[in-house]
Structure formats: structure tokens, C-alpha cells
Interface confidence: medium
Amino acid sequence: PSTLTQKHNNSSLNTRTQKACHCGHCPEEWITYSNSCYYIGKEKRTWAESLLACTLKNSSLLSIDNEEEMKFLTAISPSTWTGVFRDSSQHPWVTINGLTFKHEIKDSDNAEHNCAMLHARGLKSDRCGSSKIYHCKHKL
């Protein structure tokens, strides 16, 4: 296999991503990565239900700030809702913070697919009413 070098701890591993550590800053059963806490949901919910569930946990539905975070999250759970959506196929993709999402979202040409999920090292559109695992994120 190829070699992955992690500069964070100067070690070489034959895995594709960093190990998520359980640190004191995050609630129990949440994981820490790069100054954020992540709740890894075990149950499947629609996009709107997932949004609400995260709000009730004083956090937000999974947002992905950069490509390295995406690589990390994909390795944990390759199919999960993200906080990226659009009002319709005629509207741009935006984040739950109201920012335009500028990266590629696969299958965007499907007019019924208006919510985005993490999928195979990227984002893919799907029906907002379909049930998926959800993750929540809270920045430290």
C-alpha cells in the first residue's frame, strides 16, 4: 500500500485519515478534530429532522470548512447529511449559515435533490425527505 504521512504527529500510518481523539473539551461520546466537536449520529433522519436534532444538541448540522476536514469525516461515515441545501434546482447551493457553497455537488441536475450529503470523498445531492445518518458539529 501507499504511505500516508501525518505531519501532526510526524508518524507514518497505513490509514487514510487522522485518528479522531477523545479530548476533554467535547461532551462525552463526541469526538474532537481540529478545534471542533462532532456528534456521530446512529439513527437515520430526514434532512430537516437532522437539522432540528443538532439544534437541540446546541450544535449545527455538519458543516465542512475545508477539504482536509472532508477527508477526515468521510473516513468516519461516508454517507451522512451536511448543512448544505438549496431552495430548488433553480437556486444556488448554500450552507445553513447562508453562505454560497462553491464546491462541486454530484447529481445536482436532479431537480428533486435539494439537500447535500457526504458521499465517496465528496458531496452528493439527495432528496431532503430521505433518511440518512446525521452528524452535528460544534466549534470549540
Epitope: 500500500p1 501507499s2 500516508l4 504521512t5 501525518q6 505531519k7 501532526h8 487514510r16 485519515t17 487522522q18 475545508n66 477539504e67 482536509e68 472532508m70 477527508k71 468521510t74 464546491h103 462541486e104 454530484k106 458521499h119 465517496a120 470523498r121 465528496g122 458531496l123 452528493k124
Partner: antibody, heavy 118, light 107 residues
């Protein structure tokens, strides 16, 4: 317009070293993983190495592990490949290629030829 | 490492023909497969990603299908500019690997 321009290729003796560069423009370089891919004359494509956007994740093919080092300078929008202990079988056109989030190589440079011969 | 085997290695066809190239992975790679076109002296060009998604700007006569281990690139009606070498690539896991290529020639 996205542009990737490789440089630094040339003729080098077996056991020698060479440093390739890839100058990027037309996109936010610091948001993308970058890769080196090579192609020996008349042969197919071979992935060589990858580096994530902030250099946290670095990957190598077994054929170059321990000899090649990938790096990047986001301030200079540049990707590098330091090649040491070069062998005849490293002779190839070397391409740099950009990764979009979760996508394969959507943009490639024009390539730079490395020839390892005595 | 995951090995990709393309078939055929070379293919002769005429303008207007329907052409199919296959790519088989040595182990399952979900839908994480791309197809590239390369012309002599030029860099490869991405055609298809995620097994079946057409890259923006690529003509609709190109299509991809498959998942798991068996994948197909189809050109529905060959045009003169389509004669080139085609490569599949898996991006499911490192090391990333390419198929050996399929050379598409004019009959």
C-alpha cells in the same frame, strides 16, 4: 481560468536528484489536494504522490517511497516534487493534477519530461 | 493495491459507431471510478467521475455505468475527435491506480 504549469524536468544521471515545480493559478490553491502523476514514454499513467490542502496528509506510491518528497507552498501557489536516487525507470513525463473536493483529477498541467540516463 | 484491468487494450471503430470499454477492479471500489481521455502529447482530460457523472462541458455522447468491481465507458456515436486513449482510475483508496489504457483507433 485554472492553469497548472510544471517545470524543472531535464536530463539527470542515475542516482541524481531533481526538483519539479508546479505553478498554479486561476483557483484557490490552498483549498485543493494536489497530485503528481507520471507517464513513461509509450506507457500508461501512474499515480506518484498526493498532498492535501494544508499538507496534513501525504501519500506516496510504493515505487517512489523513500526517494521522492512532495511538498507545497500555499503562499506561492506552488507544488513541488523532490526526486532523489533517480533510476532509469523514473524516466517519464510528470504531470501535476488538481483534486476538487471528492473528485478525481479535474485539471492537469501540460507535463515536464524527466530523463534518467547515463 | 487495487488493480484495474481494462478491456479491450485496443479497439478499431468508425465514426458513428457505438463503443464500449470496460474496467474491472480487483476489489470493490463502490462508485469511486473516473474515466479520462488522452490524446498524443497532451495531458489526460477528465470525462466521467463517480462512475456515471459526466464532467461539465463533456459531450453527452459519453456515459459511464457500474459500481463495485465492474464499470463501463460508452461512446454512443463516435466523432472524429474521440479517437484517443482512454484510462479508468479508482479513487476509492490509496494508492490511487489507473487501468492500463484502451487505445481507440480509426478503422
Amino acid at each position: 481560468e485554472v492553469q497548472l504549469v510544471e517545470s524543472g524536468g531535464g536530463l539527470v544521471k542515475p542516482g541524481g536528484s531533481l526538483r519539479l515545480s508546479c505553478a498554479a493559478s486561476g483557483f484557490t490553491f490552498s483549498s485543493h489536494s494536489m497530485n503528481w502523476v507520471r507517464q513513461a514514454p509509450g506507457k500508461g499513467l501512474e499515480w506518484v504522490s498526493a498532498i492535501s490542502s494544508s499538507s496534513s496528509y501525504i501519500y506516496y506510491a510504493d515505487s517512489v517511497k523513500g526517494r521522492f518528497t512532495i511538498s507545497r507552498d500555499n503562499a506561492k501557489n506552488s507544488l513541488y516534487l523532490q526526486m532523489n536516487s533517480l533510476r532509469a525507470e523514473d524516466t517519464a513525463v510528470y504531470y501535476c493534477a488538481r483534486e476538487e473536493w471528492g473528485l478525481p483529477f479535474d485539471y492537469w498541467g501540460q507535463g515536464t519530461l524527466v530523463t534518467v540516463s547515463s | 493495491a487495487i488493480q484495474l484491468t481494462q478491456s479491450p487494450s485496443s479497439l478499431s471503430a468508425s465514426v458513428g459507431d457505438r463503443v464500449t470499454i470496460t474496467c474491472r477492479a480487483s476489489q470493490g471500489i463502490q462508485s469511486a471510478l473516473a474515466w479520462y481521455q488522452q490524446k498524443p502529447g497532451k495531458a489526460p482530460k477528465l470525462l466521467i467521475y463517480d462512475a456515471s457523472s459526466l464532467k461539465s462541458g463533456v459531450p453527452s455522447r459519453f456515459s459511464g455505468s457500474g459500481s463495485g468491481t465492474d464499470f463501463t465507458l460508452t461512446i454512443s456515436s463516435l466523432q472524429p475527435e474521440d479517437f484517443a486513449t482512454y484510462y479508468c482510475q479508482q479513487f476509492n483508496s490509496y494508492p490511487l491506480t489507473f487501468g492500463q489504457g484502451t487505445r481507440l483507433e480509426i478503422k
